[in-house]
C-alpha cells in the first residue's frame, strides 16, 4: 500500500453556460468547489483498481470528474468510454501533483455510463472508475403539508408525502398582516413534525426537498377579529382532511366554545378543546373542528360560537377536482415609455398553483397573493417597458390555466431601410403603428417633398420573438424613381422618423437618418 | 479535505428532544452517493451505530432506537441533523457524525469521522 | 440483529510484537467487516475496509483476513503510536453492528 500512489477523485459542479459533449481536458472551467469522491480500492478487483462513489446528476447539469495523483514523476493516461478512448492532457498543480480531467457539459443520458481512466506512472499502473448516471427526478414529488392529530396529545403533526424525504418546519408568527411575511423578525421556524404551541396567530407548516417548499396554512377563525367582508371559504378535495382552528381570548376563563356544521353541533371526536392564560392573564381558548377524510356530505358552513363573543363562520367547499378560476380573456395595454405599469391576474384556485410568467420564451418568477375574497392575485412588473406579448401559466394538480397579454409602449417611429434592385423597404416598430409617406428627391424637389403615391405596399406584421407588431412599406422601382434618393416617413401620435435610399444599384444604400418631432 | 463537525447541547434533561447537527464540507449529499451516519459512545463502552441518511434521502435506523431516532439533511446539503426524543440518562454518550461513501455496487462505511460532542442526559 | 464477538477484549505487548485480533459474527456477513483504530478522546480512524483492504494512508504493517463469520486483524510489528483500542464493524445487513472493542497495552 505504501508503494501506491495516493489518489484523490474529485466532482466539480459547473454553473451551466455552454452545451458539448463529454470531453478530456487538461484546464476545467471556473467552476465550484471540488467535492471530494472518496476515491478507494476496489476490493477483490484483479489489478490495481481505483473507484469513485457513484456519481449522480441531473439532465443538462455541466460536471468535471478529476483526478489528481500524488506520484513522483511524468505520468501518461488515458480516457476509456463505451470502448471508445478519448485523449488525456495531464497537467501539474502547484503542489507537483498529477491533475487529470473530464468535462462533461450538459449531461445526457448517452453521456451516462462508465469512465475509465487508465494513468501509467513511472512507478506503476492503474486504473481509475468512475460512474456517472443521471439523477432520476421523475420520480421525485412535493406533495403539500396536511395535518393529523397526535395520538393521546394535544398536538399537530405535520406530513408531506414526498420523495426525496422533505424537511418540515412549522412557520409562526403573532403578528397581523404584513409583519407576519416569510423573512419578517416576527417569524418563528421550528424545524420538526410535531407542534404542540398551538396558540399562536398565524401557523404554517411547509415541506422542502429538492423540488421546492410548499406550505399549507391552518384555517383560523379568530372571534376577536372583525369579520372579513365576505365569508371566508375554504376548499379541499374529497379524501383530504379538515382543519379549522377557532380562536378567542377573553378577560376570564368563564366563556366556552363550540362548532356547529349547518346548525348542527359536530360529533364527539370532531372536535379538541386547548386552553391557556396568556402573559396579561386573559384566558385564550382555541377550538379545533377536523376530519380526517372529507367527503362531499361536510361541505357547508361551519359556525364557531362563544359565550362572550360574536359568532363567525366559514364556508367549507369540498369538490371533486381541483380548479383555477379566472377569466382567460386577452388583454392588451398602451402604455408611456416610463409609465409605471404591471400586469395582473386575479383568480381563485385549489390546490395553489404554481405559476410563470413567459415573455420572449424566458420564464419569470411567478408570486402570488391571498386577498381577503378568497381570491388570490399574481403581478408582473418587471417587463422592462419591452413591448410584446406576456403569457401567465398556471397550473396545480388537476387544471391548467394560461392567459395572454400584450403590452404596447408609445414611442415615436425608428426608421430602418433597405433597397434592392427592384424595390425599397421601411420599417418601423413604434406604437402606435405608424402610416407612411414616399417623397422623391429631385432638382425640382430638393427638399423632397414631391409625394410618391405609386407602387407603394403597407402591411404590419408580427416580429415572432416578441410578439411585437412591425409596420413596413415597400416601393416598387419605376424608371420614373430610379437613380433618385427617396425618403420613407413614419409618422404616428408621437413623431416622424425618415430615412433616405438611393435607387441606383441592387445593394442596400441608406442614407442620413432624418428625425423630425 | 474532508470535514464532518458535530454541534448541539452539551447537557440535556431527562425526556426532552436532543437534537444533533453535523455540518460537512469538502463533500456534498447532492451529486455523488454519499451518506452521513451518526453514531455515539457511551463513556467507557463501544460504539454503537445509530442512523444514516445517504444523498438521495435513503434512510437506516438502529432497531432499538428507531421509533425514538429522525434523521434529515438539510436541501443545502451541508447539514445533517439527528433528533432523538424521550432521552433518558442512558442516552449519555459521545455522539459522533461519519461518511459513508457508495459505490457502484460496494459501501466504504466511516472513512470520515467528526471530533465528536459530548452529550449529557442528567436533570 | 448480527453480534460482533471480539477477542480478546484486551491484550498487552510489547514494541515489535505480531499482535492478532479476531472478530466473528453470529451469521454469514461475507466480507462486509471493517476494522477501526480508536485512541482516547479521539474519533475512530478506518484501517481494514471489506475484510482486507488497506485504507489510503495506513501503514503496511496492518492486514485483515478472513470471510463469512471469521475475521482477523493482524499487526505484523506493534508500533508505539499503535496502542488503542480496536473495534470491528459489520455492514452486511441493518442494523450495522460494532464488536465491544480490544484493548491493546503495553506490557
Known amino acids: 500500500n505504501q508503494d501506491l500512489p495516493v489518489i484523490k477523485c474529485v466532482l466539480i459542479n459547473h454553473k451551466n453556460n455552454d452545451s458539448s459533449v463529454g470531453k478530456s481536458s487538461s484546464y476545467p472551467m471556473v467552476s465550484e468547489s471540488p467535492e471530494d469522491l472518496g476515491c478507494a480500492l476496489r476490493p477483490q478487483s484483479s489489478g490495481t483498481v481505483y473507484e469513485a462513489a457513484a456519481v449522480e446528476v441531473d439532465v443538462s447539469a455541466s460536471i468535471t470528474l478529476q483526478v489528481l495523483v500524488d506520484a513522483p514523476g511524468n505520468i501518461s493516461c488515458l480516457w476509456v468510454f463505451k470502448h471508445s478512448s478519448l485523449n488525456c492532457q495531464p497537467h501539474f498543480d502547484l503542489q507537483n501533483r498529477g491533475v487529470v480531467s473530464m468535462v462533461i457539459l450538459k449531461m445526457t443520458e448517452t453521456q451516462a455510463g462508465e469512465y475509465l481512466l487508465f494513468i501509467q506512472s513511472e512507478a506503476t499502473n492503474y486504473t481509475i472508475l468512475f460512474t456517472v448516471s443521471i439523477r432520476n427526478t421523475l420520480l421525485y414529488t412535493l406533495r403539500r403539508p396536511y395535518f393529523r392529530k397526535m395520538e393521546n396529545q394535544d398536538a399537530l403533526v405535520c406530513i408531506s408525502e414526498s420523495v426525496p424525504e422533505p424537511i418540515v418546519e412549522w412557520v409562526l408568527c403573532d403578528s397581523q398582516g404584513e409583519s407576519c411575511k416569510e423573512e419578517s423578525p416576527a417569524v418563528v421556524k421550528k424545524e420538526e413534525k410535531v407542534l404542540h404551541e398551538l396558540f399562536g396567530t398565524d401557523i404554517r407548516c411547509c415541506a422542502r426537498n429538492e423540488l421546492g417548499r410548499e406550505c399549507t396554512r391552518l384555517f383560523t377563525i379568530d372571534l376577536n377579529q372583525t369579520p372579513q367582508t365576505t365569508l371566508p371559504q375554504l376548499f379541499l378535495k374529497v379524501g383530504e382532511p379538515l382543519w379549522i382552528r377557532c380562536k378567542a381570548v377573553h378577560v376570564n376563563h368563564g366563556f366556552g366554545l363550540t362548532w356547529e356544521l349547518e346548525n348542527k353541533a359536530l360529533e364527539e371526536g370532531n372536535y379538541f378543546e386547548m386552553s391557556t392564560y396568556s402573559t396579561n392573564r386573559t384566558m385564550i381558548r382555541i377550538l379545533f373542528a377536523f376530519v380526517s377524510s372529507v367527503a362531499r356530505n361536510d361541505t357547508g358552513y361551519y359556525t364557531c360560537s362563544s359565550s362572550k363573543h360574536p359568532s363567525q363562520s366559514a364556508l367549507v367547499t369540498i369538490v371533486e377536482k381541483g380548479f383555477i378560476n379566472a377569466t382567460n380573456s386577452s388583454e392588451d395595454y398602451e402604455i408611456d415609455q416610463y409609465e409605471e405599469f404591471c400586469f395582473s391576474v386575479r383568480f381563485k384556485a385549489y390546490p395553489q398553483i404554481r405559476c410563470t410568467w413567459t415573455f420572449s420564451r424566458k420564464s419569470f418568477p411567478c408570486e402570488q397573493k391571498g386577498l381577503d375574497n378568497g381570491y388570490s392575485i399574481s403581478k408582473f412588473c418587471n417587463h422592462k417597458h419591452q413591448p410584446g406579448e406576456y403569457i401567465f401559466h398556471a397550473e396545480n394538480d388537476d387544471a391548467q390555466f394560461t392567459k395572454m397579454f400584450t403590452l404596447n409602449i408609445r414611442r415615436k417611429p425608428q426608421v430602418l431601410a433597405e433597397a434592392s434592385a427592384s424595390q425599397a423597404s421601411c420599417f418601423s416598430d413604434g406604437y402606435p403603428l405608424p402610416s407612411w409617406t414616399w417623397k422623391k428627391c429631385s432638382d425640382k424637389s430638393p427638399n423632397c417633398t414631391e409625394e410618391i403615391t405609386e407602387g407603394v405596399w403597407n402591411r404590419k406584421a408580427n416580429r415572432k420573438v416578441f410578439g411585437q407588431w412591425v409596420s413596413s412599406s415597400t416601393l416598387n422601382m419605376s424608371e420614373a424613381i430610379k437613380g433618385f434618393l427617396v425618403k420613407c416617413c413614419a409618422y404616428n401620435s408621437l413623431g416622424t422618423s425618415c430615412e433616405t435610399i438611393l435607387l441606383n444599384s441592387p445593394g442596400p444604400f441608406p442614407f442620413i437618418q432624418d428625425n423630425i418631432s | 479535505q474532508v470535514t464532518l463537525k458535530e454541534s448541539g447541547p452539551a447537557l440535556v434533561k431527562p425526556t426532552e428532544t436532543l437534537t444533533l447537527t453535523c455540518t460537512v464540507s469538502?463533500?456534498?449529499?447532492?451529486?455523488?452517493?454519499?451518506?452521513v451516519s451518526w453514531i455515539r459512545q457511551p463513556p467507557g463502552k463501544a460504539l454503537e451505530w445509530l442512523a444514516h441518511?445517504?444523498?438521495?434521502?435513503?434512510?437506516s435506523y438502529s432497531t432499538s432506537l428507531k421509533s425514538r431516532l429522525t434523521i434529515s439533511k438539510d436541501t443545502s446539503k451541508t447539514q445533517v441533523v439527528l433528533t432523538m426524543t424521550n432521552t433518558d440518562p442512558v442516552d449519555t454518550a459521545t455522539y459522533f457524525c461519519?461518511?459513508?461513501?457508495?459505490?457502484?455496487?460496494?459501501?466504504?462505511?466511516?472513512?470520515?469521522w467528526g471530533q465528536g460532542i459530548m452529550v449529557t442526559v442528567s436533570s | 440483529d448480527i453480534q460482533m464477538t471480539q477477542s480478546p477484549s484486551s491484550l498487552s505487548a510489547s514494541v515489535g510484537d505480531r499482535v492478532t485480533i479476531t472478530c466473528r459474527a453470529s451469521?454469514?456477513?461475507?466480507?462486509?467487516l471493517n476494522w477501526y483504530q480508536q485512541k482516547p478522546g479521539k474519533a475512530p480512524k478506518l484501517l481494514i475496509y471489506?475484510?482486507?483492504s488497506l485504507q489510503s494512508g495506513v501503514p503496511s504493517r496492518f492486514s485483515g483476513s478472513g470471510s463469512g463469520t471469521d475475521f482477523t486483524l493482524t499487526i505484523s510489528s506493534l508500533q508505539p503510536e499503535d496502542f488503542a483500542t480496536y473495534y470491528c464493524?459489520?455492514?452486511?445487513?441493518?442494523?450495522?453492528?460494532f464488536g465491544q472493542g480490544t484493548k491493546v497495552d503495553i506490557k
Open positions: 461519519a461518511r459513508i461513501v457508495g459505490y457502484s455496487d460496494w459501501l466504504l462505511p466511516f472513512d470520515h
Open positions: 469538502g463533500f456534498s449529499l447532492s451529486n455523488a452517493r454519499m451518506a
Open positions: 441518511i445517504f444523498s438521495n434521502g435513503e434512510k
Open positions: 451469521q454469514n456477513i461475507n466480507r462486509f
Open positions: 471489506a475484510a482486507s
Open positions: 464493524l459489520q455492514h452486511n445487513s441493518y442494523p450495522w453492528t
